[in-house]
């Protein structure tokens, strides 16, 4: 999917609004130095690619994410203020539901969600001049 | 944990130049953009800009354009602010602070740099 | 720019009571407000990040509230050490604008 056409203001405001409450709730107890990001974005339809496969692809010792709050609300998001964007989550959606497994907070979810946390700042940043 | 290091006071003549520097220390310089705050008794806090150690970009509030420079030297971890063409207008109490860890906010100060233009 | 207008200039209270900081935006912020303090001599210390969330280490005496426009600051059963200034600052767009203060007087 290509974000360049996503009402990116309406999508950091629910950012900020709702999303990152969940974010917070999820890495409580977790120090905010404790994982380095690892994964970066250039503009914010990048660092939209970018948290969509953080969020909703299975990664090795991660397979849980989808099914968090703020995964769900990210979702949410994405498909109110991404032009056609819930349309090509449809099959997606389906391979999920087949593949869903017991939710378990391990420490690569962790560190997952904290690369997130990172994209999601990047996002949040109003356009930067390159010096 | 995380500490932002700032630089001695500065007493300065009027018309010169003078770079300030915030060293950070307990996470990593990268992931996270930097500000800087003047902070005077008349206008109170006031944000001079921001920069993403990063890639370097920069933003400014208008008024401290061609006033201000920011730059980072990702090797040291440390932030700086140049100010040029200094004036009375100048003296004031600048802090870095880092970029909060969810954005949207700032975390992080520095005990702040007390710059002095007299001549 | 967006002003942050904090209309209280300054704020007397007594030790054990329950005071509210307000801080109006000129546009809508959504919920990207903080809230600093600053005691004399020292540099501001985060309180309120994202209008509702404690930093860490802040006594949950301190509570923030608001979207969109109005924010809030609470303090409650208020701390001889709780004298000093308060400040908004908005997050939302380039130049982040600060409020211009709430000094706390303890009676």
């Known amino acids: 999917y290509d974000f360049t056409n996503c009402d990116f203001e309406k999508i950091k405001a629910a950012y900020l609004s709702t999303i990152s409450k969940d974010l917070i709730t999820y890495m409580s107890g977790t120090k905010s130095t404790e994982f380095n990001n690892t994964v970066s974005c250039s503009n914010r339809p990048h660092c939209l690619t970018e948290i969509q496969s953080l969020t909703f692809n299975p990664t090795a010792g991660c397979a849980s994410l989808a099914k968090e709050m703020f995964a769900m609300k990210t979702k949410a998001a994405l498909a109110i203020w991404c032009p056609g964007y819930s349309e090509t989550q449809i099959n997606a959606t389906q391979a999920m539901k087949k593949r869903r497994k017991r939710k378990v907070t391990t420490n690569k979810c962790l560190e997952q969600v904290s690369q997130l946390q990172g994209l999601w700042r990047r996002f949040n940043r109003p356009l930067l001049k390159q010096q | 944990q995380v500490q932002l290091q700032q630089s001695g006071a500065e007493l300065v003549r009027p018309g010169a130049s003078v770079k300030l520097s915030c060293k950070a220390s307990g996470y990593t310089f990268t992931d996270y953009a930097m500000h800087w705050v003047k902070q005077t008794l008349v206008h109170g806090l006031e944000w001079v800009g921001t920069?993403?150690?990063?890639?370097?970009?920069?933003a400014y509030t208008q008024k401290f354009q061609g006033k201000a420079t920011l730059t980072a030297d990702v090797s040291s971890s440390t932030a700086y602010v140049e100010l040029r063409s200094l004036t009375s207008e100048d003296s004031a109490v600048y802090y870095c602070t880092r970029e909060g860890s969810y954005g949207g906010y700032v975390d992080y100060w520095g005990q702040g740099t007390t710059l002095s233009v007299s001549s | 720019d967006i002003v942050m207008t904090q209309s209280q200039k300054f704020m007397s209270t007594s030790e054990g009571d329950r005071v509210s900081i307000t801080c109006k935006a000129s546009q809508n912020v959504h919920t990207a407000v903080a809230w600093y303090q600053q005691k004399p001599g020292q540099s501001p210390k985060t309180l309120i990040f994202?209008?509702?969330n404690r930093h860490t280490g802040v006594p949950d005496r301190f509570t923030g509230s608001g979207s969109g426009t109005d924010f809030t600051l609470t303090i409650s059963n208020v701390q001889s050490e709780d004298l000093a200034d308060y400040f908004c600052l908005q997050l939302w767009n380039y130049p982040y604008t600060f409020g211009g203060g709430t000094k706390l007087e303890i009676k």
């Open positions: 994202l209008a509702s």
């Open positions: 920069i993403d150690p990063e890639t370097g970009g920069t």
